[in-house]
């Protein structure tokens, strides 16, 4: 049994880091493998993660962590029984993938303005809470070409757009994702999408 593709890990910088790797053949990850992880600091405890299958030869492990800070550095040991298959390290702050924003809502009752709001996925005491910026994706269910991205570079989890920038009388969907420049993170996954019917009063034509 050998590791074909070494584990790579990403952290949500809150409580979970996810490591994925591939074996050289079909493997029952949960029965054959264990991923041990431990902070490099004095007296830290070693923890065991039981991996799950992720495709035939792929494995994924969700490492539980508390109160992640930039100094944290973990040793990782991948074991198959008594055999050490791979040894490495992982610094969560250098491999951050933020949590996806939630509760995306489209408020359509504000004159001819669409107000999109969502929730910051982090609690206020987490470092990322005040460092997230967002991308909002809006697309038409009827017209695949009607697809747009709005970059929200301010901290407030909301976006206002004129309803007239979208076509009237058709349904649209929106979703939002986040990233943090401070840790050069990857983008989060997209939030679940929300749907609304776009309609607004056309201004009277002037003759």
């Amino acid at each position: 049994m050998k590791v074909l593709q070494e584990p790579t890990c990403v952290s949500d910088y809150m409580s979970i880091s996810t490591c994925e790797w591939k074996m050289n053949g079909p493997t029952n990850c949960s029965t054959e493998l264990r991923l041990l992880y431990q902070l490099v600091f004095l007296l830290s405890e070693a923890h065991t993660c039981i991996p799950e299958n992720n495709g035939g030869a792929g494995c994924v492990c969700h490492l539980l962590m508390d109160d992640v800070v930039s100094a944290d550095n973990y040793t990782l040991d991948l074991w198959a029984g008594q055999q050490l298959l791979w040894k490495g390290s992982f610094k969560p702050s250098e491999h951050v993938k933020p949590r996806a924003p939630g509760n995306l809502t489209v408020h359509t009752n504000v004159s001819d303005t669409l107000l999109l709001t969502w929730s910051n996925p982090y609690p206020p005491d987490n470092y990322l809470y005040n460092h997230l910026t967002y991308a909002v994706n809006i697309w038409s269910e009827n017209d695949p070409a009607d697809f747009r991205i709005y970059n929200v570079t301010y901290l407030e989890p909301s976006l206002r757009i004129a309803a007239s920038t979208l076509k009237s009388g058709i349904s649209y969907r929106a979703r939002v994702r986040a990233w943090a420049q401070c840790y050069n993170t990857t983008w989060s996954e997209w939030s679940p999408s929300t749907k609304w019917h776009n309609s607004y009063r056309e201004p009277f034509e002037q003759h």
Epitope: L39, F41, L42, L43, D66, A71
Partner: antibody, heavy 120, light 107 residues
């Protein structure tokens, strides 16, 4: 309100023993890593000993290894430092501290300190 | 052991001044560094952990930065109650070690 109250300090002759105690309240003692830090006159702060939450793992500074023993009683919310074969260089104010995380790192709560003087 | 060199060892500043203290580690300590404030006759108090994280309840005029071997502690606008000795503390290497302290006085 978090409180760490040390007791047991005093004057002791070289070669003698002392047992320091630290009564903790205001936080979940049984899940906290704890430690003892000392501050000798004109010397740097020094982490003397540390212990994990269940008492199963300990750390000692080289200067006290084999002479000091850190322990805890989670049912009494109390941390201890048994000091034996005391030397003049052990003279210091001893602080009971709580580790901020589940490892030896930054210390977020400190007691008021108890003074230990080793002298003949 | 990792040596922590703090500078200056003492400094005098006026109320409202921006005050900067530096701490240099003899080898890489990542961002495993804390800053403490100790007032005369009192126990040290944690201000900053993990090099730049402000401890809960600590005024925002205190800040920390740096990684590796070079660290900075800053008071953006000195207040009379900030008169104290400040210590850095690395906990990346074993044993954990402290700086010699910086005594801050008011002009």
């Amino acid at each position: 309100e978090v409180q760490l109250v040390e007791s047991g300090g005093g004057l002791v002759q070289p070669g003698g023993s002392l047992r320091l105690s630290c009564a903790a309240s205001g936080f979940t003692f049984s899940s906290s890593y704890m430690s003892w830090v000392r501050q000798a006159p004109g010397k740097r702060l020094e982490l003397v000993a540390a212990i994990n939450s269940n008492g199963g793992k300990t750390y000692y500074a080289d200067s006290v290894k084999g002479r000091f023993t850190i322990s805890r009683d989670n049912s009494k919310n109390t941390l201890y430092l048994q000091m034996s074969s005391l030397r003049a260089e052990d003279t210091a104010v001893y602080y009971c501290t709580r580790q901020r995380g589940n490892y030896v790192g930054a210390m977020d709560y400190w007691g008021q300190g108890t003074s230990v003087t080793v002298s003949s | 052991d990792i040596q922590m060199t703090q500078s200056p060892s003492s400094l005098s500043a006026s109320v409202g001044d921006r005050v900067t203290i530096t701490c240099q580690a003899s080898q890489d300590v990542s961002t495993a560094l804390a800053w403490y404030q100790q007032k005369p006759g009192k126990a040290p108090k944690l201000l900053i952990y993990s090099a730049s994280n402000l401890e809960t309840g600590v005024p925002s005029r205190f800040s920390g930065s740096g990684s590796g071997t070079d660290f900075t502690f800053t008071i953006s606008s000195l207040q009379p109650e900030d008169i104290a000795t400040y210590y850095c503390h690395q906990y990346y290497g074993s044993p954990p070690t402290f700086g010699g302290g910086t005594k801050l006085e008011i002009k």
